[in-house]
């Protein structure tokens, strides 16, 4: 019962985590304009992995996709790759774990097969969560570096009367969503791996048991008790690695000029 609960909870936690990773990857607020120097800006800038947006006080938001692939920073490409790998692994992990759930019976699938599948999905969730955490952390590090670089630039070259305020970016909501989601996927994966241990069938073999009716001596040879934990030689661990590509079009969503009531 505890095993089923652990497996089920692991699946649900991973599902929430992967949904969060997908949400974070799609979100536009990976970096948002730092308002420390100009808290009263009438124009607010924010950027995602796929496009950058500008929100005006008027209510209009303009988003432009990053149409170039080669012109983008290598770090951004790396973050995109990590997030996509995380999503793909997580999605495959979810698919595998559905069939591995103890509460779902598919034909005459043995418990050992379910244990293997649970372990496989668990490992996938762990790797998926780590990919998301790594991706978000790489982006956060990039932001911190750029933040301090732009801060240094803000106080140089201001000899003239005219001031040019450089836009600085700070952590966006997507980073926190990504960190939490990655953590949940990781926890879910660990729970699946723990559940795998309890799922493996206990093989009890009674070898060479002989009864001699004629004699007084009874020879009893207990066979080797073997419990499959799922981590033994009978378990085949399969790591699946896949990548994905995605293109994003320019989006400009405005309410119409004549918005009749």
């Amino acid at each position: 019962m505890a095993v089923t609960a652990c497996q089920g909870l692991g699946f649900v936690v991973s599902l929430i985590g992967i949904a969060g990773i997908i949400a974070a990857t799609c979100m536009d607020q990976w970096s948002t304009q730092d308002l420390y120097n100009n808290p009263v800006t009438a124009v607010f800038n924010y950027q995602g992995l796929w496009r950058s947006c500008v929100r005006e006080s008027s209510g209009f938001t303009e988003c432009r996709g990053y149409f170039t692939l080669l012109g983008l920073p290598a770090m951004l490409q790396a973050v995109r790759a990590l997030m996509i790998v995380g999503i793909v692994l997580g999605a495959i992990g979810l698919l595998v774990s559905i069939f591995a759930l103890k509460c779902i019976r598919i034909g005459s699938m043995e418990d050992s097969a379910k244990a293997n599948m649970t372990l496989t999905s668990g490992i996938m969730f762990i790797v998926s969560g780590l990919c998301a955490i790594a991706g978000v952390s790489v982006f956060a590090n990039m932001l911190v570096t750029n933040f301090w670089m732009s801060t240094a630039n803000m106080y140089t070259g201001m000899g003239g009367m005219v001031q040019t305020v450089q836009t600085r970016y700070t952590f966006g909501a997507a980073l926190f969503v990504g960190w939490v989601a990655g953590g949940l996927t990781l926890i879910g994966g660990v729970m699946m791996c723990i559940a795998c241990r309890g799922l493996a069938p206990e093989e009890t073999n009674y070898k060479a048991v002989s009864y001699h009716a004629s004699g007084h001596s009874v020879a009893y040879k207990p066979g080797g008790f073997k419990a499959s934990t799922g981590f033994g030689s009978n378990t085949k661990n399969k790591k699946i690695y896949d990548g994905g590509a995605r293109t994003e079009d320019e989006v400009q969503s405005y309410p119409s000029k004549h918005d009749y009531v």
């Epitope: 304009q33 100009n38 009263v40 800006t41 009438a42 124009v43 800038n45 950027q47 950058s52 947006c53 500008v54 005006e56 006080s57 008027s58 209510g59 209009f60 303009e62 432009r64 005219v162 001031q163 040019t164 305020v165 450089q166 836009t167 405005y254 309410p255 000029k257 004549h258 918005d259 009749y260 009531v261």
Partner: antibody
């Protein structure tokens, strides 16, 4: 057709209060940022206040901060400017305007006159 | 606060003439996020509210004649009327729409010779 009609302007004594209204028609007020701008007797334009779309953030010029309050009633499709502790320098023609691309005001009302005098 | 300085304060022209007026800001109005300048030009005729002419420094509002052209970037902006008509006689204001307070210039009055 988009229309903005201001009302509530009057002759008021220094230290008095006044509430200006701006009735909007032809568009949904809540979907747009709105501003109040005044024109002083010497014909200078002065931005007074802005309420952004959704009405979460409000902004005021330093000269009216703490004395004026911008608000809107989405059900009535009306924008308001509550003015208190009025000074003689608040004497002006008050216009309300709808914010468009680039935070520019694409539609203006005809204005309502506020005179602060003893 | 961003200070907007308009010049000249008044212009006396003849119909058909090309007119150029200037607007300078104390801070850059260029937004790095979309590479747009948040400067607006308005036209105000006597007894009327101001009318939007140009936004984003160079984008003409619908219905505005194409003889009106906005240009410039950062801190220096220009409004050009290629061939002045009698109906163009008005006061022209520039406005900072980038940072609060959304300051206006003192205006340039266009008069007929």
């Amino acid at each position: 057709e988009v229309q903005l009609v201001e009302s509530g302007g009057d002759l008021v004594q220094p230290g008095g209060s006044l509430k200006l209204s701006c009735a909007a028609s032809g568009f949904t007020l809540s979907r747009y940022g709105m501003s109040w701008v005044r024109q002083t007797p010497d014909k200078r334009l002065e931005w007074v206040s802005t309420i952004i779309s959704g009405g979460i953030n409000t902004y005021y010029s330093d000269s009216v901060k703490g004395r004026f309050s911008i608000s809107r009633d989405n059900a009535r499709n009306t924008l308001y400017l509550q003015m208190s502790s009025l000074k003689s320098e608040d004497t002006a023609m008050y216009y309300c305007g709808r914010l468009y691309y680039g935070n520019a005001m694409d539609y203006w009302g005809q204005g309502t006159a506020v005179t602060v005098s003893s | 606060d961003i200070v907007m300085t308009q010049s000249p304060s008044s212009l006396t022209v003849t119909a058909g003439e090309k007119v150029t007026m200037s607007c300078k800001s104390s801070q850059s109005l260029l937004n790095s996020g979309n590479q747009k300048n948040y400067l607006t030009w308005y036209q105000q005729k006597p007894g009327q509210p101001p009318k939007l002419l140009i936004y984003w420094a160079s984008t003409r509002e619908s219905g505005v004649p194409d003889r009106f052209t906005g240009s410039g970037s950062g801190t220096h902006f220009t409004l050009t009327i290629s061939s002045v008509q009698a109906e163009d006689l008005a006061v022209y204001y520039c406005q900072n729409d980038y940072s609060y307070p959304l300051t206006f210039g003192a205006g340039t009055k266009l008069e007929l010779k």
